[in-house]
């Protein structure tokens, strides 16, 4: 069985389909989640929708074999299997691993440490979002791009505000939070 990976945002409508055409004049087509939990089966010209968490949220297109799922949630994370019984009596299967991710929330930037050191301003900022597996990137006047949740930097004496932006992202969404400092070492706004 071929395995395709799909990542989508929760609440969206999803189409699970294969990139090739279905076997000609197939006898039966069934979509499963996990190994043997049936969602829908097409047989003898009729679609039968099974009692499952998907009932009322799915529709099968027997022509293409596509399965439409509305309003997917994180609980719908699974490997979906489409099995076709061909006219020669043999089975063929395709798998789609669906990952449903929530959109990331707007991050909160916290000042972990702020102190004057020899006329310089030492800053340690953390970018916080609740219990998510995300990527972090800090932007601002920094020597290099920083890709973790904590930013440590030292500000030389300066006349203007310095702002730092934390971007949190997963594969379906991203959000920014910004914190600015006024000279010499005063938190201005976020």
């Amino acid at each position: 069985g071929r395995l395709v990976h799909m990542t989508v945002v929760s609440g969206s409508n999803v189409t699970l389909n294969i990139s090739e055409s279905l076997p000609e004049n197939y006898k039966q087509l069934t979509w499963f989640y996990t190994f043997d939990q049936k969602i829908v089966e097409w047989d003898s010209g009729k679609s039968k929708y099974f009692e499952s968490k998907f009932k009322g949220r799915v529709r099968l297109d027997p022509q293409s074999g596509a399965l439409y799922i509305s309003k997917v949630q994180k609980e719908d994370n699974s490997t979906y299997v489409m099995r076709v019984l061909k006219k020669d009596g043999y089975e063929q299967e395709w798998k789609i691993k669906l990952q449903v991710l929530d959109p990331v929330p707007k991050p909160v930037i916290k000042i972990e440490k702020r102190e004057d050191v020899d006329d310089n301003c030492y800053l340690k900022l953390s970018c916080v979002i609740p219990g998510e597996s995300v990527n972090y990137t800090w932007y601002g006047e920094l020597p290099k791009e920083i890709q973790n949740s904590v930013l440590e930097t030292t500000l030389k004496p300066h006349k203007h505000s310095r702002c730092y932006t934390c971007q949190v992202s997963n594969s379906v969404s991203s959000k920014n939070g910004t914190f600015c400092f006024s000279p010499p070492c005063t938190a201005a706004r976020s």
């Epitope: 190994f35 043997d36 049936k38 099995r83």
Partner: antibody
Framework: EVQLLESGGGLVHPGGSLRLSCAAS????????MSWVRQAPGKGLEWVSL????????YYADSVKGRFTIFRDNSKNTLYLQMISLRAEDSAVYYC???????????WGQGTLVTVSS | EIVLTQSPGTLSLSPGERVTLSCRAS???????LAWYQQKPGQAPRLLIY???SRATGIPDRFSGSGSGTDFTLTISRLEPEDFAVYYC?????????FGQGTKVEIK
Amino acid sequence: EVQLLESGGGLVHPGGSLRLSCAASGFTFGGYAMSWVRQAPGKGLEWVSLISGSGGSTYYADSVKGRFTIFRDNSKNTLYLQMISLRAEDSAVYYCAKYSNYDYFDPWGQGTLVTVSS
Amino acid sequence: EIVLTQSPGTLSLSPGERVTLSCRASQSVSSSYLAWYQQKPGQAPRLLIYGASSRATGIPDRFSGSGSGTDFTLTISRLEPEDFAVYYCQQYGSSPRTFGQGTKVEIK
């Protein structure tokens, strides 16, 4: 008439290996999922493993995961169960069964006895 | 996983009697996805009933199944000598597929 005939059982020491076979006839073998179900002496039935008709998907009971491997050769109409790191609690009659439309088991083979003992 | 509990464990009866076997699920079995099997000593199990109430091919009509949700019943209207065996229920509404522990019907 659908027929399933298991073989390969026997006496093996704990930690040993065994490969069971199930020869199928009377139906289009590659069109059906197949299963192994076991029954310890004097006990009830315990589902062990499943494989889809094409062989592309497999599924195992937690008690055998990582130790047993189910596979099939559709050109030979044969189902297999490779068992390694065998334990005393794996002693049972092992049945192969046709997994009818991914629902229930029908029919079953006559079974092959596996005894794990030192 | 769904746990199936069969009762009674053993039934001692005479030929000609009516038998009622119970299978109770720890949670609802969707769409009555329940099967019954018969197993005689030294033999493999044989499918009797699927979908809670549909008889498998070649099964005599003295065997009938009923029930839904969590409570299922296998009835043998009139015991024949060849019906003395162990009977198992099995659910196929959720993974993993599970069996009850069996009910033995023996001759009194």
